[in-house]
C-alpha cells in the first residue's frame, strides 16, 4: 500500500525519507481521541507536506491532520477503533508514502500524576502511590506501570518495578539510610490495546531516615 509519488514535480521529494511514526491517545479529552504523527527524520522539509487518515472512521471517509510545528495532530470522536486505517503523507493530492495502522496498537497512555511517597514508621516501609486518568476511561483501562527509583547520587542505577496497581510498598531495609531518592512512573497498555510507554510522571523526591544506633532502625524524618 505504501509507495512513492512518480510525478516529475516531486523528484526532489522522492529522494527524501518520509518515514513517520504515530501514536494514538484514546478518550484524551472527554470522549475525543487524538492521533499524533511525526517524521522520523527531523530534517525533512515539511513546508508543503500534509497527513491524511482514511478508513476505519465513523461517518467520514478521510480526515486531515492539523500541523503544529513539527508534529501533525488530529483530535476527533470519529475513530472506529476496529480495523486498520491508512495514514498517508501527501503533497497536494499526491501520496508520498502510506502506512496501514490499527489505532488500537499504537496507544500511548497519558502520564501518571500525583506521585507521592509516605514513610510508615511502625511498618518500616514507604508507601508509593500515584494516579492515572485511565482509571476513569472506557477503553484503555488495564495498564502496566513502571515505577523507577534511584538514589540521587547514582545517576544511572535505576531500580524498576513493573506492576498493575497504583500503589507500591518499598521496604525500608532495601533502601540506603539517610539518602535522597528520586522516583518516577510511566505506563503502557497491557490488555487488548497495545502501544508505547507514556511520558514519565514528574519526579518525586524523598529522604530515607537515619539509622537509630540503639535499635538499628531508621529515625523517622
Amino acid at each position: 500500500e505504501s509507495g512513492y509519488a512518480q510525478n516529475g514535480d516531486l523528484e526532489d521529494a522522492e529522494l527524501d525519507d518520509y518515514s513517520f511514526s504515530c501514536y494514538s491517545q484514546l478518550e484524551v479529552n472527554g470522549s475525543q481521541h487524538s492521533l499524533t504523527c511525526a517524521f522520523e527524520d527531523p530534517d525533512v522539509n515539511i513546508t508543503n507536506l500534509e497527513f491524511e487518515i482514511c478508513g476505519a472512521l465513523v461517518e467520514v471517509k478521510c480526515l486531515n491532520f492539523r500541523k503544529l510545528q513539527e508534529i501533525y495532530f488530529i483530535e476527533t470522536k470519529k475513530f472506529l477503533l476496529i480495523g486498520k486505517s491508512n495514514i498517508c503523507v501527501k503533497v497536494g493530492e499526491k501520496s508520498l508514502t502510506c502506512k496501514k495502522i490499527d489505532l488500537t496498537t499504537i496507544v500511548k497512555p497519558e502520564a501518571p500524576f500525583d506521585l507521592s511517597v509516605v514513610y510508615r514508621e511502625g511498618a518500616n516501609d514507604f508507601v508509593v502511590t500515584f494516579n492515572t486518568s485511565h482509571l476513569q476511561k472506557k477503553y484503555v483501562k488495564v495498564l502496566m506501570h513502571d515505577v523507577a527509583y534511584r538514589q540521587e547520587k547514582d545517576e544511572n542505577k535505576w531500580t524498576h518495578v513493573n506492576l498493575s496497581s497504583t500503589k507500591l510498598t518499598l521496604l525500608q531495609r532495601k533502601l540506603q539510610p539517610a539518602a535522597m531518592y528520586e522516583i518516577k512512573v510511566r505506563s503502557i497498555p497491557d490488555h487488548y490495546f497495545k502501544g508505547f510507554w507514556s511520558e514519565w510522571s514528574p519526579s518525586y523526591y524523598f529522604r530515607t531516615p537515619e539509622i537509630n544506633n540503639s535499635s538499628g532502625e531508621m529515625d523517622p524524618i
Epitope: V161, N162, L163, I188
Partner: nanobody, 117 residues
Amino acid sequence: QVQLVESGGGLVQPGGSLRLSCTTSGFTFTTYAMKWVRQAPGKGLEWVAFISPAGGITDYADSVKGRFTISRDNAKETLYLRMDSLKPEDTAVYYCARGDSDTNNNRGQGTQVTVSS
C-alpha cells in the same frame, strides 16, 4: 513473605520440550510483572523472558526467541515457561522471579533443566 516455587525441570534430549511452572504466594500475583531467569554452570544469571501483569506484554532473550513461551494464569497465581526445540546450551537452573530489577532477592530455589543426548 514472597514465596516462589519452580517445578517441571528434568533431563531432556536436544529438540525436546519441557514446561516449567512457578507457583507463588505471599504477594498479589496479579499486580506484578514476572520473569524467568537462568544460571548455567559457572555462569552468571541470564534473563530469559518477561510477562506483564495482565499478560498482554511479553519479551524474550534473543537466544530463546521463537522457542520459549512465557505465560501466566492469574487465577492460579502461577507462571509458566514452555520450552521447545531445546538445545544443550539451554542447560541451566531456571528461576522464576518478580519483574523487579532485584532478581537476587525475589526468586525461588530453581529447577534444573539438562539438555543432553
